[in-house]
Interface confidence: low
């Protein structure tokens, strides 16, 4: 005889940590290993992300949840969930498609990520470089000549640096 | 549902900048990465970079780095790209693309062309 | 960069065929691979990430495979609707780098 069928989905109770297995008269069957289903009345189970190579493992896999991976030392994470990890780099340099590169003169980068930024131009505000700058550090710009009296030593803090990676605007 | 709706075609002169925008709505801003890829006529998809729309840093692939900037406004949920100093091979369709292991959604795209 | 390199270029097909596309990667990218579907004047959409995992709402009829260097997408019984331009991407590292594009046409 032809069974009734359920009005309600019998997938639907069917909780994470398993799937509705239409080859089973949609049964509720565990996620098979490697693989997970964060919620309820899945049909099929998520393959748990791998953390190869350059990745590294910061949680393991469970049959509700996927791993969670970052990156090894030397790399550091990009994007939600770290779905990159990108090579670091020392202060003064930039990483090129060749590799870690020093910053070019007139350039500095203060982080491990990120590309060499120009220093500061401080005869645009009419201010005197008060100290150089190097690859690691931007120049401090200082009151110019001019504006100096008796008296005054007032320093101006450099700018705000930009976000880490932008390019100059 | 998750939507992306950038901002619509321009013509620029060579020399000028470009300032591209995609909205996102339907979901979390925060919670994925926006990356931008373009298609000149006729040609395959180029990655051009993405932003953690969290931090607001930026990754720009290496033939874009000093003429691409990425930007974002969480309280409006918009990313940005601009792209400056054009020239006529950047004639093309700009797509921006939520990321979350793959480019899983996509803006219409915004057709850029180049011309004097 | 990893190289994605994808065949054929183009091919003909009839409704119902079964079609192969495949993507060779130039380094190992583990499974760190997506194919999206192309109309013209159209976005691309995700069809496959992590190799064989269908995005939402993708027809079982396509399905993805491979891991290391070797991917292949497979249309079981190619529809109407299916001609279209195909792009395999690996994200294993960055750059992301997409491959060159599969043209499929009416034959």
């Known amino acids: 005889f032809e069974r009734t069928r359920s009005l309600q989905d019998p997938c639907s109770n069917c909780p994470a940590g398993t799937f509705c297995d239409n080859n089973r008269n949609q049964i509720c069957s565990p996620c098979p290993p490697n693989s997970f289903s964060s919620a309820g009345g899945q049909r099929t189970c998520d393959i748990c992300r791998q953390c190869k190579g350059v990745f590294r493992t910061r949680k393991e896999c469970s049959s509700t949840s996927n791993a969670e991976c970052d990156c090894t030392p030397g790399f550091h994470c990009l994007g939600a969930g770290c779905s990159m990890c990108e090579q670091d780099c020392k202060q003064g340099q930039e990483l090129t498609k060749k590799g870690c590169k020093d910053c070019c003169f007139g350039t500095f980068n203060d982080q491990k990520r990120g590309i060499c930024r120009p220093w500061t131009n401080c005869s645009l505000d009419g201010k005197s470089v008060l100290v150089n700058g190097t690859k690691e550090r931007d120049v401090v710009c200082g009151p110019s000549p001019a504006d100096l009296s008796p008296g005054a030593s007032s320093v101006t803090p450099p700018a705000p640096a930009r976000e880490p990676g932008h390019s100059p605007q | 549902q998750v939507q992306l709706v950038q901002s619509g075609a321009e013509v620029k002169k060579p020399g000028a900048s470009v300032k591209v925008s995609c909205k996102a709505s339907g979901y979390t801003f925060t919670d994925y990465s926006m990356h931008w890829v373009r298609q000149a006529p006729g040609q395959g998809l180029e990655w051009m970079g993405w932003?953690?729309?969290?931090?607001?840093?930026?990754t720009y692939a290496d033939d874009f780095k000093g003429r691409v900037t990425m930007t974002r406004d969480t309280s409006i949920s918009t990313a940005y790209m601009e792209l400056s100093r054009l020239r006529s091979d950047d004639t093309a369709v700009y797509y921006c693309?939520?990321?979350?292991?793959?480019?899983?959604?996509w803006g219409q795209g915004t057709l850029v062309t180049v011309s004097s | 960069d990893i190289q994605m390199t994808q065949s054929p270029s183009s091919l003909s097909a009839s409704v119902g065929d079964r079609v192969t596309i495949t993507c060779k990667a130039s380094?190992?990218?583990?499974?760190?691979v997506a194919w999206y579907q192309q109309k013209p004047g159209k976005a691309p959409k995700l069809l496959i990430y992590?190799?064989?995992i269908r995005h939402t709402g993708v027809p079982s009829r396509f399905s993805g495979s491979g891991s290391g260097t070797d991917f292949t997408l497979t249309i079981s019984s190619l529809q109407p609707e299916d001609f279209a331009t195909y792009y395999c991407?690996?994200?294993?590292?960055?750059?992301?780098?997409f491959g060159g594009g599969t043209k499929v046409e009416i034959k």
């Open positions: 932003i953690n729309t969290e931090t607001g840093e930026p």
């Open positions: 991407q690996q994200r294993y590292t960055t750059p992301p780098t």
């Open positions: 992590w190799a064989s």
């Open positions: 380094q190992d990218v583990s499974s760190a």
């Open positions: 693309a939520r990321y979350d292991y793959a480019m899983d959604y």
